[in-house]
Interface confidence: low
């Protein structure tokens, strides 16, 4: 079950607990997490992570017991950890991952917890002993049972089945806001000296919150949102409001680089490196942060803040959230990802921007692109309109800008001349007594995927040229062949003549020159990320996935790619998992990514695989994966034995029993079989696929995977009274493929 940092489950406990057998398996990357609370008016049992260590607090009547794991073993490493806490006959024992961590005597009184069990968080429970407890769990509870019964059922709508992908997402995975009430909360955004917030935004939302940070003083905040398709930033301080708009449209479904920069003197928002900033009025001063940095949505308190604000910042959208995604998020220069979030609501790992709706456009016919770019640019308020001074010649009567800009069209990887039609003057230069050589262009920001090449001595270094150079075809754009269909140059244009003219022309005007890239279909090709040799154990199967081979095609999505296995189909070792025995001569890139394919070795020398991949228009050259089958070697890694009280049960965990094989990047099936009769007990396996609360059954065989999932245990069934410790010798054999290791 997945808990997102603000959720919990409650389980009623109507009677006192005399014995406790609590088993939890959890994983989290957060150093703080409340795992479980059994709550009564005074009696309680609390299990929490604090600074990455597991702490157990048991209060029975007047007695208090505390147990904790060692400081050097941090459990906030995103790896599943199994915790077993037993309280039986006045003795409490805590073990983590099969190792005994602590034990202590406890009073024999039953635990009176009529308020029930709280799993993953305490909800609205307000009890004095809960002060200072950890935050609610953000992570997964893979299993939670008390005295053999599941604590994870029924799930409430905000606690999800399984373990969410977002908990293991690295910070290069986008934050996907799937709405309508999406939200990600991160540690507070401090802006004492200066604060920066940077991300790449992809959305079609015309109104949506992007970032909110409350201040320590009531009513102070920083708020960034999309307002009517453009970025807006608001800083509210005791002494007034600073409001800033950026004129670059962002609600076009394209990625935009966003940067928000704040210090005591000014606020700046920049979209695709086009900045807007306040003058250095010094009104901002320092905003002491309070609470979390909210991204993509607002919580109830933030909504209230904004609704109460005199500017009426959120007319109808206080509960709306961003529909789209943020990539490459960094806060004050530190990368942040879903894993660092304190809580999330309705989030997805990765950018799945309304895929269904736009898939056809994204990979459709290339002709479609020629109509996209020109329509995307006119909304840009560049340059800033120029207001001519009074008394200028009549030619400047209705003057606002010197040039009319038209997009430059270039083929992917090709070149295009910058021509007069791209930068056409709005007035008659002769009448204004201006020469083409006096209209000076300087490149203030180059294109992301190409270079403006100037065939003029010394100009390339200065990045400057004139309108006369344009007419003489001295400036051409060379595209680098990348796949983006649009780009832009930022040009500053000034006039160097000494004739009467608006002062803005002397200072210079900034223009955006859109560049539209017409795509070219590139053929796909096959790459082997770990080399073109694959090792498999004899008589086993190995998954074929992107870690073995993959297609690289810069202009086709995975959906459009198909692999073919070349050679005779009879005896072909590639199969779909769900169609064993049936050769897979052709399969899709999606199937490969989904892990649907396996290489099956049935004996003899392994067969090499030769593939090619096609995007429907062009196919790659064939590529061969060499396959070597090796004989399984099995080695005992751990066989520690168990120590348990007569009549009790103890899980057999990897710390007690595990083997290693010579498999390379292959998750092989390791089978243990009991070869001798047991005298004092029985080996049991949990039925029904490891469901919490499922029954335990006597078994003669189990897999290493069962051990890893805590589904195997030894149950002492010997009723006789012994004056000495009895020893059960468990004789096992291990099988991998057709290789057997006996007398384990």
């Amino acid at each position: 079950a997945s808990f997102f940092g603000e959720n919990h489950l409650e389980v009623p406990v109507a009677t006192a607990l005399t014995d406790i057998d609590l088993q939890l398996q959890f994983s989290t990357s957060q150093p703080e997490a409340l795992l479980l609370l059994a709550a009564g008016p005074a009696d309680h049992l609390l299990l929490q992570l604090y600074s990455g260590r597991l702490q157990v607090r048991l209060v029975l009547g007047q007695e208090e017991l505390r147990l904790q794991t060692p400081a050097e073993t941090l459990l906030s490493d995103s790896i599943p950890h199994t915790v077993v806490l037993t309280v039986v006959e006045g003795w409490a024992t805590l073990s983590v991952d099969g190792f005994l961590n602590a034990s202590s005597a406890v009073p024999g009184a039953p635990l009176e917890v009529p308020y029930g069990l709280f799993v993953g968080g305490t909800g609205t429970l307000g009890l004095p002993y809960l002060r200072g407890t950890s935050r609610p769990l953000r992570g997964c509870l893979h299993a939670a049972t008390l005295n053999g019964r599941s604590l994870l059922r029924p799930l409430t709508p905000d606690v999800h089945e399984g373990c969410a992908e977002e908990f293991s997402a690295s910070d290069d995975v986008a934050l996907g806001f799937s709405g309508p009430h999406s939200l990600a909360a991160f540690p507070a955004w401090g802006t004492q000296d200066e604060g920066t917030l940077e991300f790449t935004l992809t959305t079609q939302s015309r109104q949506a919150p992007l970032a909110f940070q409350a201040g320590g003083r009531r009513g102070d905040f920083i708020y960034v949102d999309i307002f009517e398709g453009h970025l807006r930033a608001v800083v509210e301080k005791g002494q007034g409001t600073v409001l800033l708009h950026n004129s670059v449209p962002v609600a076009d479904g394209q990625p935009h680089e966003v940067s928000v920069h704040i210090n005591a003197h000014r606020l700046e928002i920049s979209v695709d490196q086009y900045p807007t900033h306040t003058s250095n009025r010094g009104v901002l001063s320092y905003l002491e942060p309070r609470g979390s940095l909210l991204l993509g949505g607002l919580d109830a308190e933030a909504s209230r803040h904004l609704q109460e604000h005199r500017l009426g910042l959120t007319p109808e959208a206080t509960n709306a959230s961003l529909l789209g995604c943020m990539e490459d998020l960094s806060v004050n220069g530190q990368r942040r990802g879903l894993r660092e979030a304190l809580l999330t609501r309705n989030m997805a790992a990765g950018c799945r921007l309304e895929e269904e709706e736009y898939e056809d456009d994204a990979y459709g016919h290339y002709e479609a692109f020629s109509t996209l770019a020109p329509e995307a640019w006119p909304a840009m308020e560049l340059p800033e309109p120029c207001v001519p001074e009074p008394g200028l010649p009549p030619v400047f009567a209705n003057f606002t800008q010197l040039l009319t800009i038209s997009p430059l069209v270039v083929a992917e990887g090709g070149t295009a001349w910058l021509e007069w039609r791209h930068v056409q003057p709005t007035l008659d230069l002769m009448e204004a007594e201006l020469r083409k050589s006096q209209v000076l262009f300087s490149v203030t920001r180059g294109a992301r995927h190409g270079e403006l090449e100037l065939d003029i001595p010394g100009a390339q270094a200065r990045k400057m040229f004139t309108l006369l150079d344009v007419v003489n075809r001295k400036a051409r754009f060379i595209h680098d062949g990348s796949e983006d269909t649009s780009d832009q140059l930022v040009l500053e244009v000034s006039v160097t003549a000494r004739v009467p003219m608006p002062s803005c022309l002397r200072r210079g005007q900034t223009y955006l020159l859109p560049i539209q890239v017409n795509p070219v279909n590139d053929p796909p090709h096959i790459i082997f990320p770990h080399g073109s040799l694959m090792v498999i154990l004899e008589h086993t199967q190995k998954p074929l996935g992107p870690e073995v081979f993959q297609a690289y095609d810069p202009d086709s999505a995975c959906e459009g790619l198909t692999f073919q296995v070349l050679g005779t189909s009879s005896g072909l070792p590639v199969e779909r998992r769900d169609q064993p025995g049936e050769p897979a001569t052709e399969f899709s890139c999606r199937e490969l990514e989904a892990g649907s394919l396996v290489y099956v070795h049935r004996g003899g020398p392994a067969q090499d695989l030769t593939f090619r991949v096609s995007d429907g228009l062009q196919a790659s050259p064939p590529a061969t994966l060499k396959v070597v089958a090796i004989r399984p070697a099995i080695q005992i890694h751990r066989s520690t034995g168990l120590r348990l009280a007569q009549g009790s049960a103890m899980p057999i965990l990897p710390a007690n029993l595990s083997v290693e094989t010579n498999a390379v990047g292959q998750d092989v099936s390791v089978l243990f079989r009991v070869t001798g009769a047991l005298q004092f007990g029985e080996l049991q396996k949990q039925g029904a696929g490891g469901v919490e609360g499922a029954e335990w059954w006597a078994t003669q065989a189990f897999h290493q995977r069962d051990v890893e999932q805590g589904r195997v245990r030894y149950l002492s069934t010997d009723p006789q009274h012994h004056a000495y410790d009895t020893v059960e010798n468990l004789a096992l054999e291990v099988q991998v493929g057709q290789e057997i290791l006996s007398n384990l």
């Epitope: 599941s150 029924p154 029904a688 609360g693 029954e695």
Partner: antibody, heavy 122, light 107 residues
Framework: EVQVEVSGGGLVQPGGSMRLSCAVS????????MNWVRQSPEKGLEWIAE??????????YYAESVKGRFTISRDNSKNSLYLQMISLRAEDTAIYYC?????????????WGQGTLLTVSS | DIVMTQSQDSMATSVGERVTVNCKAS??????VAWYQQKPGQSPEPLLF???YRYTGVPDRFSGSGSGTDFTLTISSVQAEDVAEYFC?????????FGQGTKLEIK
């Protein structure tokens, strides 16, 4: 011995209101999550509402079919559970049972009252 | 919502016979299923919880099995007093839902 007595059923017109009560003895009422479940020939058994403990701020959960029309409440001092129903419809006609949840092993119903019949008809 | 479907609306058997009542969930509910018995004119009473655990005082001729989506209530040797309607219920997720019931009659 556990006893669960339900009262308050009867005939009511569509659009009307009704309050059902449930008195409990024989177990510590304040420690149990309580529910209303109804049964009709058309829909069979149907869970409709749950109320938790004082320590849970008396959190309430409802089935979609009754959300906004029915309100579950409890009075621990009187060992009583209530169901206030407004905007009643013909499809609310059923026998209404007051039930409690089993002890921490899961959300199954272990104590059932004898039920009271509510008929919504003009 | 999770739909619980009991394959037979009614079944007739003889005293001493073994009988099984089936229940299918529309999605995985692990073992979070309870069974109830409702005798004519009475309230339902719990028989089993967690798919296979007998409720206090329930005779051991009643047993249950299953996990995931398929569940079975078995009466190993039917007695005259077992004439009743039997319901399954899932408590894997809200809303909690019941099967439509299976009536057991004696021939």
């Amino acid at each position: 011995e556990v006893q669960v007595e339900v009262s308050g059923g009867g005939l009511v017109q569509p659009g009307g209101s009704m309050r059902l009560s449930c008195a409990v003895s024989g177990f510590t009422f304040s420690n149990y999550w309580m529910n209303w479940v109804r049964q009709s020939p058309e829909k069979g058994l149907e869970w409709i509402a749950e109320i938790r403990l004082k320590s849970n701020n008396f959190a309430r959960y409802y089935a979609e079919s009754v959300k906004g029309r029915f309100t579950i409440s409890r009075d621990n001092s009187k060992n009583s559970l209530y169901l206030q129903m407004i905007s009643l419809r013909a499809e609310d006609t059923a026998i209404y049972y007051c039930t409690s949840y089993g002890n921490y092993v899961g959300h199954y119903f272990d104590h059932w009252g004898q039920g009271t019949l509510l008929t919504v008809s003009s | 919502d999770i739909v619980m479907t009991q394959s037979q609306d009614s079944m007739a058997t003889s005293v001493g016979e073994r009988v099984t009542v089936n229940c299918k969930a529309s999605q995985n509910v692990d073992t979070n299923v309870a069974w109830y018995q409702q005798k004519p004119g009475q309230s339902p009473e719990p028989l089993l919880f967690s798919a296979s655990y007998r409720y206090t005082g329930v005779p051991d001729r009643f047993s249950g099995s299953g996990s995931g989506t398929d569940f079975t209530l078995t009466i190993s040797s039917v007695q005259a007093e077992d004439v009743a309607e039997y319901f399954c219920q899932q408590y894997n997720s809200y809303p909690l839902t019941f099967g439509q019931g299976t009536k057991l009659e004696i021939k």
